[in-house]
């Protein structure tokens, strides 16, 4: 019967008595930076080319005995998970292995850097089809390793890495913390985060998604026909590398941004039990388990968006946090969140020729997060329209006045320490769909975009008194681009998008003794692209 | 024994290749920074990645590496260039004493220096 992990990543339409989705990634080359591997194992023979690259430190300990099967164990298993004949994800993918980890599974940042450079030079000398680089390793945060990954990603290479097995914030490790890398956490057959001894999978905002990573059957270097079960975020990353290879084989022109958005879009949503994660990390950790798309082509018509959380601002009065989208993505909205509720909103601003989302801490606050909604919108022309605080009137208003521009998000930023004492509602785009309305003491920022066939609408859901959280979701065929809260009182901790749902968090009414007049409303801006849908229909 | 001879050879070469023409000062206003792994047991002191500014050419990387060796040799330190990076990041990997970091950070074209550290199979 099909191993649990392959079943988990397979859409129902492919599920028969065996796993055999179409096109096994045959146009894609997957580079594996790991231990040495047993390349003639029956599972992977002829699929893995062992390069002559080797850069490893000496093994620790004077009595270390170099046993070939142990030296090859980790890499052989991962090669099998990516492209193994019987237990692999992308059975058609060809692989190239570089040895950067010694027989104890240990390597160096410098050896990994030289390995990445080797891949780049190979790519320049002999350009082939799409490249996926699998980095099933982790070290402490490294500026230089992250920088090298960024350069390789900008050269068109898809990098996939393990989140780490330290039951810790993945942002403290590299290459897991590199924004350009697809960082993968591990889940088990029950869709729970994987526990590994006293530790387990890493988590947090630097994780892009999770994938099967416990009791994964794959090639064993103990013998040429042996299989073994291994666990870890390396195994999870190998699944995503395989899925990426299959997606790229079906659509070789996909950019890294497009691939990442598709991986997120086709993942199983909200199946992970978040109670396993530390409380402060739950909101930051994506509740996504990787899966193959239901069909190899298509999906191009969809407006894809993802949520990007910033690092925490820190508690100082003037502290800010910035969330950035990838180079090929458009920032369509910006929101903020603070656990203490003390914040001064957020704004979209230009930085280095690109829009970023900046959130502002308030006096006495423990710090804020900026939350960017990053979308793939071809031929988009987006700008931010700002209205300074109106002060005298009932509220500040700003709208998208340019012909053909639609409102994709509203942000609000204020200098006063607490808007909670001022009653006028904040961020009410109701009435005129292309308008943001906010508090008279706040400056309001509207994200206005022109793109072929783009249409947007506002959806609201309010409840009489703060009850922890209010949500509103976009319906099928529409994509959430903006998420904000009404009103802007101190009860509201912030707003953020989770998949296609806008979540507004507020302090519990029982602890604040608030009255029903302080209702909380979640406001979603839902968009779709008729142009992308038509283009997709014409292709079919 | 073989390694020591290799280091000695590099030291001699470094002394011979010292050129007055290489003595331009680092650019004003930009201070190179030093980074190391926050997890102490994973640190590998004695090996450093010297990362140069983005547009630095290979020839400049090699020249900067030679200059570091020459200046270190004048102070009686042995250094060994293990690798010169180009293609992804400009820079070089050097085996040297941590005492030389201050000197290395002042070299022209240097953006930052990172102490090598361990990575592990996951």
């Amino acid at each position: 019967s099909i191993p649990w992990n392959l079943e988990r990543i397979t859409p129902p339409r492919y599920r028969a008595d065996e796993y055999q989705p179409p096109d096994g990634g045959s146009l894609v080359e997957v580079y594996l930076l790991d231990t040495s591997i047993q390349s003639d194992h029956r599972e992977i023979e002829g699929r893995v080319m062992v390069t002559d690259f080797e850069n490893v430190p000496e093994e620790d300990g004077t009595r270390f005995h170099r046993q070939a099967s142990k030296c090859d164990s980790h890499g052989t298993h991962l090669a099998g998970v990516v492209s193994g004949r019987d237990a692999g994800v992308a059975k058609g993918a060809s692989m190239r292995s570089l040895r950067v980890l010694n027989c104890q599974g240990k390597g160096t940042v410098s050896g990994t850097l030289i390995g990445l450079e080797f891949i780049r030079k190979s790519q320049l000398v002999q350009p082939v089809g799409p490249l996926v680089v699998l980095l099933p390793l982790a070290g402490g945060y490294s500026r230089v390793l992250n920088a090298a990954c960024q350069r390789l990603a900008r050269a068109g290479v898809v990098l996939v890495t393990a989140a780490g097995n330290f039951r810790d914030d993945a942002c403290l490790y590299s290459p897991a913390s590199a924004p350009e890398v697809i960082t993968v956490g591990a889940t088990n057959a029950q869709d729970q985060p994987v526990t590994l001894g006293t530790l387990g999978t890493n988590f947090g905002r630097c994780v892009d998604l999770f994938a099967p990573g416990e009791d994964i059957i794959g090639a064993s270097s103990d013998c040429s026909t042996c299989f073994v079960s291994q666990s870890g975020t390396s195994q999870a990353a190998a699944h995503v590398a395989g899925i990426a290879a299959m997606m790229l084989s079906a659509e070789p022109e996909l950019t890294l941004a497009e691939l990442r958005q598709r991986l997120i879009h086709f993942s199983a949503k909200d199946v992970i039990n978040e109670a396993w994660f530390p409380e402060d990390q739950r909101v930051l950790t994506p509740n996504l388990v990787a899966a193959l798309p239901p069909s190899t082509h298509g999906a191009g018509w969809q407006l894809f968006c993802r949520t990007v959380w910033s690092a925490h601002s820190g508690p100082t009065r003037m502290a800010t946090a910035i969330a950035r989208c990838a180079p090929d993505e458009e920032l369509l909205s910006c929101s903020s969140f603070s656990r203490s509720g003390k914040r001064r909103g957020e704004r979209m601003e230009a930085q280095g020729g690109k829009l970023v989302c900046r959130a502002h801490n308030a006096f006495g606050g423990e710090g804020v997060y900026a939350i960017a909604r990053c979308c793939l919108l071809p031929q988009a022309n987006c700008s931010v329209h700002t209205a300074p605080p109106a002060e005298a009137s009932m509220g500040t208003r700003v709208h998208c006045h340019q012909q053909g521009h639609v409102l994709t998000g509203c942000s609000s930023h204020w200098e006063v320490e607490d808007l909670g004492t001022h009653k006028p509602p904040v961020l009410r785009p109701r009435g005129q769909p292309n308008q943001c309305v906010g508090h008279r003491e706040a400056s309001i920022h509207a994200s206005c975009c022109h793109a072929p066939g783009l249409e947007c609408k506002v959806k609201e859901h309010g409840i009489p008194a703060p009850q922890g959280q209010v949500t509103v979701a976009c319906e099928e065929g529409w994509t959430l681009t903006g998420c904000s809260a009404l009103p802007g009182t101190s009860h509201v901790l912030g707003a953020y998008a989770v998949d296609n749902t806008c979540v507004v968090r507020s302090r519990d009414v029982s602890t604040t003794g608030s009255t029903s007049e302080e209702a909380v409303t979640a406001v979603a801006i839902c968009c779709r692209s008729r142009h992308l849908a038509q283009a997709s229909q014409e292709l079919q | 024994q073989e390694d020591e001879d290799g280091d000695y050879e590099e030291l001699v070469l470094a002394l011979r290749s010292e050129e007055d023409g290489l003595a331009e000062a680092p650019e004003h206003g930009t201070t190179a920074t030093f980074h190391r792994c926050a997890k102490d047991p994973w640190r590998l002191p004695g090996t450093y990645v010297v990362v140069l500014k983005e547009e630095t050419h290979l020839s400049q990387s090699e020249r900067t590496a030679r200059r570091l060796q020459a200046q270190a040799a004048r102070r009686g330190y042995l250094t060994k260039i293990l690798h010169v990076f180009h293609g992804l990041l400009p820079g070089f990997l050097v085996k040297m004493s941590g005492d030389l970091l201050e000197l290395a950070l002042k070299l022209p074209h240097v953006d930052y220096i990172e102490e090598d550290s361990s990575v592990f199979a996951q």
């Epitope: 065996e18 390349s39 003639d40 029956r42 013998c223 026909t225 | -």
Partner: antibody, heavy 115, light 109 residues
Framework: QVQLVQSGAEVKKPGASVKVSCKAS????????ISWVRQAPGQGLEWMGW????????NYAQKVQGRVTMTTDTSTSTVYMELRSLRSDDTAVYYC????????WGQGTTVTVSS | QSALTQPASVSGSPGQSITISCTGT?????????VSWYQQHPGKPPKLMIY???NRPSGVSIRFSGSKSGNTASLTISGLQAEDEADYFC?????????FGGGTKLTVL
């Protein structure tokens, strides 16, 4: 191109040993092992075992285990299959083939066991 | 006694399609994605025609196709030609070894 070239025909007496060679070329040797398959006259194919060019590990079929030894000489890219204590029913054409997938075959070596 | 069962012979006229079956167990054909088919002309070594159930090596005619259902694999040859007359063997992985079928003699009438 990928090629497996085998040694010439052998005639042996019962109880003797035979050693057949197979020289591989045209591909990365360590990416594949070598399988040995035999075919008795007018019969089907029988898999005898496999050897790794990468680390010399072997995997023998139960039927010949104890009588067969497969070895490699990486310097000449050659694999050897030695069969001991020959019997008349060992008379067959012996083939080497690339890997478990057996996608490329040698030309075959006829071994005749006769008193 | 071969581990995999094939019909001893099949025949067909030029232009017709024929199918050769290869039946095993869940420990071989049913348990692995690695069923291969070989063609062997008299006095020649076998030639790989299909690998991993349904994949064709380059150079093999698209008239040859493979499939699998449960513990039985099949080789189909469409548009039979005179040169297709040969012996055909299937093979499969087992947990630690390889097994072949007894072979099927294809006669093109």
């Amino acid at each position: 191109q990928v090629q497996l070239v085998q040694s010439g025909a052998e005639v042996k007496k019962p109880g003797a040993s035979v050693k057949v060679s197979c020289k591989a070329s045209g591909y990365t040797l360590t990416s594949y092992g070598i399988s040995w398959v035999r075919q008795a006259p007018g019969q089907g194919l029988e898999w005898m075992g496999w050897i790794s060019f990468y680390n010399g590990n072997t995997n023998y079929a139960q039927k010949v285990q104890g009588r067969v030894t497969m070895t490699t000489d990486t310097s000449t890219s050659t694999v050897y299959m030695e069969l001991r204590s020959l019997r008349s029913d060992d008379t067959a054409v012996y083939y080497c083939a690339r890997g478990y997938g057996m996608d490329v075959w040698g030309q075959g070596t006829t071994v005749t066991v006769s008193s | 006694q071969s581990a995999l069962t094939q019909p001893a012979s099949v025949s067909g006229s030029p232009g017709q399609s024929i199918t050769i079956s290869c039946t095993g167990t869940s420990s071989d054909v049913g348990g692995y994605n690695s069923v291969s088919w070989y063609q062997q002309h008299p006095g020649k070594p076998p030639k790989l025609m299909i690998y991993e159930v349904s994949n064709r090596p380059s150079g093999v005619s698209i008239r040859f196709s493979g499939s699998k259902s449960g513990n039985t694999a099949s080789l189909t040859i469409s548009g039979l030609q005179a040169e297709d007359e040969a012996d055909y063997f299937c093979s499969s992985y087992t947990s630690t070894s390889m097994v072949f079928g007894g072979g099927t003699k294809l006669t093109v009438l």
